[in-house]
Interface confidence: low
């Protein structure tokens, strides 16, 4: 079955700092969205192998990628308090599959000691239920996507 492993569950960074979020996917995959959850979920990036990544204006110039779409590490730089939130990986496949989420806490230097990450993945209010399909960006159907060559056949 298709699944997305996402790590870490929680990370704390100072204002101006950086965080890494890793999305690992098994099975057939067309691409990866990183979405910031909340009342109005926002797409942060879309990444697809051999494709120019799309980055939300708010994060342009602050995002780096390493790895490939099935094992992608997204680095967010120059963090601001407004970047605090839960970020989830969304695998674009026949159906939409979500990672467990990463809670990113961006703190002022003086309040760093007040914040702790537990070992458990974010749940409940920290990780809203993935938005309904109608709230998702329209995605091409599988039949509309080019057939992807196997990894060994990739140039």
């Amino acid at each position: 079955a298709q699944e997305v492993q996402q790590s870490p569950h929680c990370t704390i960074a100072p204002v101006g700092g950086s965080v890494n979020i890793t999305c690992s996917t098994s099975g057939e995959l067309h691409g990866i969205y990183l979405r910031q959850l909340g009342p109005q979920p926002q797409n942060i990036i879309y990444y697809e192998d051999r494709v120019v990544p799309t980055t939300d204006k708010r994060f342009q110039g602050r995002i780096d990628f390493s790895g490939s779409q099935d094992n992608l590490t997204i680095t967010m730089h120059h963090l601001q308090p407004s970047d605090t939130g839960t970020y989830t990986c969304q695998a674009v496949t026949e159906i939409n599959v979500y990672g467990s989420g990463t809670l990113v806490l961006v703190t002022e230097e003086q309040s760093q000691g007040l914040h702790r990450c537990s070992d458990a993945p974010p749940t409940g209010s920290a990780l809203p239920v993935p938005p309904t399909t109608s709230a998702l960006p329209a995605l091409p159907t599988a039949s509309a996507l080019p057939a992807l060559p196997t990894a060994s056949a990739l140039p």
Partner: antibody, heavy 129, light 107 residues
């Protein structure tokens, strides 16, 4: 306007060297894979090689006839692509085009659409004694 | 390397004709195939990507079909500006390879 402009072509003797440049504008050059394609007089198109974007390792691939003689490089800070041609042969005579790699695909939040490959106007390289 | 066999190498047609150009590959490339149009002294112009998707700004009289090893570029109604040379290209594996071209001439 999305544009690629090649320069550096000219007449060179067999065994000589030449460096072609390609200046990009109007698009995010640093995230593009870039290729060189050539066309000998009266002949078809021949892929020369390509360079990936830095986030994909910036690695290069070459066609067999030029491997070991040609070197593709890029300078993202000035949106420039280069083709260093060494040990030139008469059969390297051609118009050389700089292009965005045809695998380059832009996506937005609502759809997935391919940006039309961008091609320069070409620069002519003549290898003759 | 993947070999690209384009046919015919040239054809004569009249304005208003329907024209079909075929491209056969030496191995399965799924739909990783592009079509280009080139006029004398000009750079190639992308027409079709992923075998059947029309590039932005290309007239709808151009269409592409096929998958696997057999592909076709069709011009439903030939216009005067369509007289040119057409190339297919596979982007499935390195080295990227082009077909030999099909020159569409005025009858």
């Amino acid at each position: 306007e999305v544009q690629l402009v090649e320069s550096g072509g000219g007449l060179v003797k067999p065994g000589g060297s030449l460096r072609l440049s390609c200046a990009a504008s109007g698009f995010s050059f640093s995230v593009a894979w870039m290729s060189w394609v050539r066309q000998a007089p009266g002949k078809g198109l021949e892929w020369v090689g390509r360079i990936k974007r830095k986030t994909d390792g910036g690695t290069t691939d070459y066609a067999a006839p030029v491997k070991g003689r040609f070197i593709i490089s890029r300078d993202d800070s000035i949106k420039a692509l280069y083709l260093q041609m060494n040990s030139l042969k008469t059969e390297d005579t051609a118009v050389y085009y700089c292009t965005t790699d045809p695998l380059l695909r832009y996506s937005d939040w609502l759809s997935h659409s391919l940006m039309g490959d961008v091609w320069g106007q070409g620069t002519t390289v003549t290898v003759s004694s | 390397d993947i070999q690209m066999t384009q046919s015919p190498s040239s054809l004569s047609a009249s304005v208003g004709d329907r024209v079909a150009i075929t491209c056969r590959t030496s191995q399965n490339i799924n739909n990783y195939l592009n079509w280009y149009q080139q006029k004398p002294g000009k750079a190639p112009k992308p027409l079709i990507y992923a075998a059947s998707s029309l590039q932005s700004g290309v007239p709808s009289r151009f269409s592409g079909s096929g998958s696997g090893t057999d592909f076709t570029l069709t011009i439903s109604t030939l216009h005067p500006e369509d007289f040119a040379t057409y190339y297919c290209q596979q982007t499935y594996s390195i080295p990227l390879t082009f077909g030999g071209g099909t020159k569409v001439e005025i009858k």
